[in-house]
């Protein structure tokens, strides 16, 4: 499967949509900044094989999809942009799932990188907890939007893994 190119294109489209979703000026939200601790050190220090990269990226996109599919999210963002963004994420998930089947030959993601997947889940738990603590305020969502954009950009090591042959 030609994942690097399709993923890169969809990823760019998702980031553009996410950038357009802002409703308030980020300048007014500086005091709401928060340390979510994206596990970039763990990712940077690891050379991902293709199947590993696919499964971790899948988890990141799935968690992002879940986060932006909540009722609170629907209230926070402009509906048509949110729908386009969710559709883009859903397509990425489909692409990754199709690729896993092709790469591994089974409909199961290998369990070799549970630690990385757990790190991603904990990261999104911290984001969800922050939103709850901030009562899903517009600024809290703005901070989360910026954080998701950053984490999407940070996953370069994972994207390098997509180009590798297992």
């Amino acid at each position: 499967c030609d994942l690097p190119q399709t993923h890169s294109l969809r990823n760019r489209r998702a980031l553009i949509l996410l950038a357009q979703m802002g409703r308030i000026s980020p300048f007014s939200c500086l005091k709401d900044r928060h340390e979510f601790r994206f596990p970039e050190e763990e990712f940077d220090g690891h050379q991902f094989q293709k199947t590993q990269a696919i499964s971790v990226l899948h988890e990141m996109i799935q968690q992002t999809f879940n986060l932006f599919s909540t009722e609170d999210s629907s209230a926070a963002w402009e509906q048509s942009l949110l729908e386009k963004f969710s559709t883009e994420l859903y397509q990425q998930l489909n692409d990754l799932e199709a690729c896993v089947i092709q790469e591994v030959g089974v409909e199961e993601t290998p369990l070799m990188n549970e630690d990385f997947i757990l790190a991603v889940r904990k990261y999104f738990q911290r984001i969800t907890l922050y939103l709850m603590e901030k009562k899903y305020s517009p600024c809290a969502w703005e901070v989360v939007r910026a954080e998701i954009m950053r984490s999407f950009s940070f996953s370069t090591n994972l994207k390098k893994g997509l180009r590798r042959k297992d």
Epitope: G22, R33, E147
Partner: antibody
């Protein structure tokens, strides 16, 4: 390598206009805000304003509001600071620096080398 | 605007001395405080961000502490290259503001 490269020193007369630049490279220009800081001869640092190059949203310090204009051209990864009518009191070193916006990352971690503006008749 | 007040405005110290500079904000800024070092003719250099995080590449003799309104920059053992002017800056709300600076001179 992250770099902010500013335009060269300028010598101007009072009443003239001026636009100085700050070109970012080695990072995603639209992922960081660009701030401008003034330092008058022998004095401390004064924060002037900031721009988000992704949408050109701008904020100024009250002391500089209406005195200068901050802009950006994301297609060439460049931020600008401009004056429509310079005064002798605008004589200073001007620095640009990048800011991570709402992300939890170091504030103003990279600075331009500075542009010295001299206004004299 | 939030006012930032640094003290002292200047100090004389010797190599090996422990140096402490304080910065006070006119209202709470949580931990959104940065410290910069500036040498003559050079651009400022970030030393500490978010009150206590050491910027990459900065020697561990520099440390920052505090939250709310009172902050401290400490140089545990002053080195010859540390003679410079130090500024604090709040990034809690716009407009960002700097302290007036503290000049560290050789005794």
């Amino acid at each position: 390598e992250v770099q902010l490269v500013q335009s060269g020193a300028e010598v101007k007369k009072p009443g003239e206009s001026l636009k100085i630049s700050c070109k970012g490279s080695g990072y995603s220009f639209t992922s960081y805000w660009i701030g401008w800081v003034r330092q008058m001869p022998g004095k401390g640092l004064e924060w002037m304003g900031i721009i988000d190059p992704s949408d050109s949203d701008t904020r100024y310090s009250p002391s500089f509001q209406g005195q200068v204009t901050i802009s950006a051209d994301k297609s060439i990864s460049t931020a600008y600071l401009q004056w429509s009518s310079l005064k002798a009191s605008d004589t200073a070193m001007y620095y640009c620096a990048r800011h991570p916006g709402l992300n939890w990352a170091p504030d103003f971690d990279y600075w331009g080398q500075g542009t010295l503006v001299t206004v004299s008749s | 605007d939030i006012q930032m007040t640094q003290s002292p405005s200047s100090l004389s110290a010797s190599v090996g001395d422990r140096v402490t500079i304080t910065c006070r904000a006119s209202q709470s800024i949580s931990k959104f405080l940065n410290w910069y070092q500036q040498k003559p003719g050079k651009a400022p250099k970030l030393l500490i961000y978010f009150a206590s995080s050491l910027q990459s590449g900065v020697p561990s003799r520099f440390s920052g502490s505090g939250s709310g309104t009172d902050f401290t920059l400490t140089i545990s053992s002053l080195q010859p290259e540390d003679f410079a002017t130090y500024y604090c800056q709040q990034s809690n709300t716009l407009p960002f503001t700097f302290g007036q600076g503290t000049k560290v001179e050789i005794k």
